[in-house]
Interface confidence: low
């Protein structure tokens, strides 16, 4: 609440509830394929009403409570810790009939030296300590168990892993006399997976490692390691996949260069370069081999690490990501945007689009925003007429019985969805924009004019008159 500059920030609780061990997954019913919505897209509301009605009528047959809450489990191995030495943990909501497991990595920037970690501990302790996490957490967006909110994977086993290591999920160093803080992000993921095997994950068919923001980057850094871990532990049949939301950053030139003073103003390459040493950070082995010693920071950038990954990964990224703009020293205040800044922002979108060119499974709307998959309204945004849950469903189909993305896209079921229009919020399904200065909602026309876009220039590539474009934008069509 107070003066936060976070990507995402959550959580607190007293002692954990008594543990209840899950029954082993042996003998679970074989799960059907994902629903194919192709035939019902024209009448989704009616279809969802039927699904809900069916779910409610089947409720008496189910031992599960229709309860949205994920319950906290602190790790049994208390040597795997948050920054301050308190045990790391995870929130779990089991779905006994399902062989799909969704593990979500929370985001929330990072800190990379004693000074900014101390400051983070003072102002955002939930991102460095489990001492006060709540016992329960509500599943929202892709973590929701409601088919209306999560048409993609509502019936999956849901796991939320709070971010308390401040290391972009890469660290492997414990607290000691020498180290004031532990940075164990990579080890926390490994330990959570190990514990979940005893809670039913052993019977999984698909494990989807998802994350937003720093958690999205964490997915890119850890997905292959999780697959390797499961193979080594004797579970090679579990298909491991990644879903990286808002964690695909560019190591581009800042709009205005500033010295590396704090987390926000430090150029991303420099912050990660310093962080990796401070955290004893680990990166995917195949990526590490591509760079010289001391250059491992390169592997934190999606477009560099992605080609080295073995597991299929779906990339979700706003073309005009607010966290990217923040580290690039772009701050959209109440003042109209200057020409140079407008061109910088447009160029950022172009560069990002270019890096996604060879990413077969991607969803990149031309919006100014940050994070999407655990927002309740994550279903609202569309690219070329396809929503994100629909694109993920198509991705599942394309991967069915195969670890590699099929080369030929399924007809009418696209997975590569990158907006091609060139300015922020040219996609009418973008989330509402707020003036960062006043907090007021702005309509798209207002926003574009505030951004310094001349309506004539914006209208011409669309073959429209400026008045037609304004009317179209105002109607949100």
């Amino acid at each position: 609440s107070e003066g936060r500059k976070t990507w995402r920030r959550r959580g607190q609780q007293p002692p954990p509830p008594p543990r209840t061990e899950a029954a082993p997954a042996a003998g679970q019913p074989v799960e059907s394929f994902p629903l194919d919505f192709t035939a019902v897209e024209g009448n989704m509301d009616s279809f969802m009403a039927q699904v809900k009605s069916l779910a409610q009528s089947l409720y008496p047959c189910s031992a599960q409570q229709l309860n949205e809450d994920l319950r906290l489990h602190l790790l049994l191995d208390t040597s795997v810790t948050c920054n301050d030495g308190s045990p790391a943990g995870y929130y779990l909501k089991e779905s006994r009939g399902s062989r799909r497991w969704l593990l979500f990595l929370e985001g929330g920037w990072y800190c990379f030296n004693r000074e900014n970690c101390d400051s983070r501990y003072d102002t955002m302790r939930r991102l460095m300590s489990s001492r006060d996490w709540p016992r329960t957490r509500t599943g929202t967006g892709i973590l929701s168990s409601q088919p209306e909110e999560n048409p993609y994977w509502w019936n999956a086993n849901m796991v939320f892993i709070p971010y308390c290591s401040s290391d972009v999920w890469s660290g492997a160093s414990s607290k000691s006399e020498k180290n004031e803080y532990a940075f164990m992000g990579a080890l926390i993921i490994q330990e959570v997976v190990r514990e979940l095997l005893g809670r039913g994950l052993s019977g999984a068919k698909v494990l989807l490692l998802a994350g937003s923001s720093a958690g999205g980057t964490g997915v890119l850094l850890n997905v292959d390691r999780v697959a390797e871990q499961l193979e080594k532990l004797g579970y090679p049949a579990i298909q491991v996949r990644g879903l990286a939301d808002s964690g695909w950053f560019l190591d581009n030139k800042q709009y205005r260069h500033t010295d590396c003073v704090d987390t926000i103003t430090c150029a991303p390459t420099e912050a990660i370069r310093r962080g990796i040493r401070y955290w004893n950070g680990v990166v995917p082995e195949r990526c590490r081999r591509q760079f010289q010693e001391g250059e491992e920071w390169n592997c934190f950038f999606g477009y560099k690490v992605y080609p080295t990954l073995r597991c299929p990964v779906f990339v979700v990224q706003w073309l005009f990501d607010e966290a990217q703009l923040t580290v690039d020293n772009v701050h959209l205040t109440g003042q109209p945007v200057q020409e140079g800044l407008r061109l910088y922002i447009q160029n950022l979108g172009r560069e990002l689009r270019h890096t996604l060119k060879d990413v077969p499974a991607s969803f990149a709307p031309a919006c100014l925003s940050h994070e999407i998959i655990i927002r309740s309204h994550w279903t609202d945004v569309q690219v070329k007429g396809t929503s994100l849950p629909r694109a993920l469903h198509c991705w599942d189909r394309s991967l069915h019985d195969s670890h590699k993305a099929s080369k030929t896209p399924l007809k009418g079921c696209p997975v590569h969805l990158v907006d091609s229009c060139p300015w922020p919020h040219c996609n009418p399904s973008c989330p509402t924009v707020r003036d960062q200065f006043t907090g007021q909602e702005m309509n798209v026309a207002q926003f574009l004019m505030h951004m310094g876009f001349d309506m004539q220039t914006v209208a011409q590539p669309q073959g429209l008159e400026p008045s037609e474009l304004l009317g179209m934008l105002s109607n949100g069509s």
Partner: antibody
Amino acid sequence: EVQLVESGGDLVKPGGSLKLSCAASGFTFSDYGMHWLRQAPEKGLEWVAYISSGSTTLSYANTMKGRFTISRDNAKKTLSLQMTSLRSEDTAIYYCARKNYNGGYFDVWGTGTTVTVSS
Amino acid sequence: DIVLTQSPASLVVSLGQRATISCRASKSVSESGYSYMHWYQQKPGQPPKLLIYLASNLESGVPARFSGSGSGTDFTLNIHPVEEGDATTYYCQHSRVLPPTFGSGTKLEIK
């Protein structure tokens, strides 16, 4: 035992000043953000001011901005509220409360000290 | 500021029955899976006591007769079964942003 004890409440004339103190014990005071809240006679609860654990963030209710100053001394485990230009509507029981790390709720309250502003 | 409207202002419930108190926020107090709404009990001459935090989490030492639910703008405190000692005033409070605000209180009477 975790405890907060307020002191300094008194009868004061309108326009006068008063300094309230809150002594903490039984927990690591420097780890917690602290708040002052108040409750006028037969009325509900009202938030007054907040100070973060390291004093880096200070915040005040609009009606008290410029008149009240919150401060803390982590070495002495004390929280203070300096009140100036007091008005009759400042008459209330003043409570100090501990902010639970980041949930923003008040998990430990003091017993309160009474401030009466009257001519 | 976010305004919290608590209802009813007073409530009479028979011993052993359920008491339900509502709190409505003027805008959502939920964010990314957490609902920043809390409930307190205040007995005459005493400071408030935390019962429920983050909408549904029971503070340690509080009897399981107390429960909280809700998200977004609508929240509920339930007490079941009601006991004699529960006859007092209850407040909701949000901490979604500064300033935190309180509801105007609900006075519970037991008959």
